[in-house]
Amino acid sequence: EVEKTACPSGKKAREIDESLIFYKKWELEACVDAALLATQMDRVNAIPFTYEQLDVLKHKLDELYPQGYPESVIQHLGYLFLKMSPEDIRKWNVTSLETLKALLEVNKGHEMSPQVATLIDRFVKGRGQLDKDTLDTLTAFYPGYLCSLSPEELSSVPPSSIWAVRPQDLDTCDPRQLDVLYPKARLAFQNMNGSEYFVKIQSFLGGAPTEDLKALSQQNVSMDLATFMKLRTDAVLPLTVAEVQKLLGPHVEGLKAEERHRPVRDWILRQRQDDLDTLGLGLQGGIPNGYLVLDLSMQEALS
C-alpha cells in the first residue's frame, strides 16, 4: 500500500478541478499543492468538495498563510468560510465590499454567527467608519444589525449613512441606541419638507427630545400610537394635552387603550384632569382640580 504521506503516482493535481472530489482525504493532502490551491481559489467555490475535504483545504491554506489569508483568497472561500473560526477571521484584513458581500452570501438566511460578527467588525474597523454602502449591505443581510451595535459604535455612523436605514432595521434598538441615531437622522433629513421629513424621521423618534416633539406637534403629522408608545418617557412628560392632541391628530383616541402603559400612564399622571377631560376619552388619573403641582426637581436644581 502507498505510504499515506506520499502522493500516488499520476495523482498529483495540475489544477483544481472536479476530479479531486474523488480523492481521499490523505490523497488531497498529499497531491494538492497549497500554492496551486491559493491561485485557483475561484474554482473551489464551483466544486462541491465533501465536508471532510473542506477541512483538508482549510488546513492547506492555514499552513500557507499562518498570519492570515490574503483578500484574493478570502473573496473565494465560499462554504470554506463556514469552516473558519473567529480566531482565523481576526487575522484577516478585509477591505473590499465585494469580499464582504461574497462571504455574507454564504451565510444568507441564517442568524448572524460569531464568524460573521467578527468579519463585520474587522471590515468596519478597517474602513474607520460605517459608511452608507457598508450599512446598505449589512442591513440587507441582517436587518437587526444596527441595533446590535453599542451606542459607542453607533457614534461612528456618519449622518449620510442614515439614508440606508429602513424602519425594520430599528425594530430591536433600545432607547440608548436611538439617542445616538436620532440626532444623526435629524441632520440627514433636515432639508426635507414637513410630511416627507416625518415619514423618514418617524422610526428614529424614540431618541427625540421634548422640544422636537413640541415642534412636530405644530406640523399636523398625525403620529400613530405605535410610534408614540416608543417615545422616551422623559420627552413625553412635559408635553401638554393640547400638544399631544396635535401630535397624534386622529390617532389621539388610541390613548384610552394605552392608558395603563408607559409613557401614556406616566404622562396622564402629570396632566390636569380638567385638561384630560377635554379629550373626551375618559382618561382618568390626572391631577384633580384645585391641586397645586410643585416641580421639586427644578427646586433642587436651583438650590
Epitope: 462541491p48 465536508y51 462554504y79 469552516k83 451565510n107 441564517h110 460569531p114
Partner: nanobody, 119 residues
Framework: QVQLVESGGGLVQAGGSLRLSCAAS????????MYWYRQAPGKERELVAF???????NVRDSVKGRFSVSRDSAKNIVYLQMNSLKPEDTAVYYC?????????????WGQGTQVTVSS
C-alpha cells in the same frame, strides 16, 4: 437538521442491477450537494457519486458507465442506479450531505444499506 434514510440494498448476482434511494427530510432547502459513499469490509470509506442542487453529477472512475446518480427534487429523494454489478461493489452504501447552519457546516449521514454482489 437533516435526516437521511437509504433503502434498496440487497443480495444480487454479478451483472445484475439495483437502485438505491436516499430520502431526505428536515432542512432540505439548505441542501446543496448529496453524496453516495461506500465502505467495503476492512477498507476505507470512498466517495462513489454526487449530485449537486443544480443537477450536475459525477461518479468515480471505477464505476463510470455502470453507476449513475439522479434526484427527484419534489420528493427530496436521490437515487444511485447501479448496473453491471461486480463482486467488488459489495459494501455498505451511505448517503451524505452537509448544510450551513448557525454559522458553520453540519454533516449528516444515513444509516447505510448493504449491497452484496455474489459471483
Amino acid at each position: 437538521q437533516v435526516q437521511l434514510v437509504e433503502s434498496g440494498g440487497g443480495l444480487v448476482q454479478a451483472g445484475g442491477s439495483l437502485r438505491l434511494s436516499c430520502a431526505a427530510s428536515g432542512s432540505t432547502s439548505s441542501i446543496n450537494t448529496m453524496y453516495w459513499y461506500r465502505q467495503a469490509p476492512g477498507k476505507e470509506r470512498e466517495l462513489v457519486a454526487f449530485i449537486s442542487s443544480g443537477g450536475s453529477t459525477n461518479v468515480r472512475d471505477s464505476v463510470k458507465g455502470r453507476f449513475s446518480v439522479s434526484r427527484d427534487s419534489a420528493k427530496n429523494i436521490v437515487y444511485l442506479q447501479m448496473n453491471s454489478l461486480k463482486p467488488e461493489d459489495t459494501a455498505v452504501y451511505y448517503c451524505n450531505t452537509y448544510i450551513p447552519y448557525g454559522g458553520t457546516l453540519h454533516d449528516f449521514w444515513g444509516q447505510g444499506t448493504q449491497v452484496t454482489v455474489s459471483s
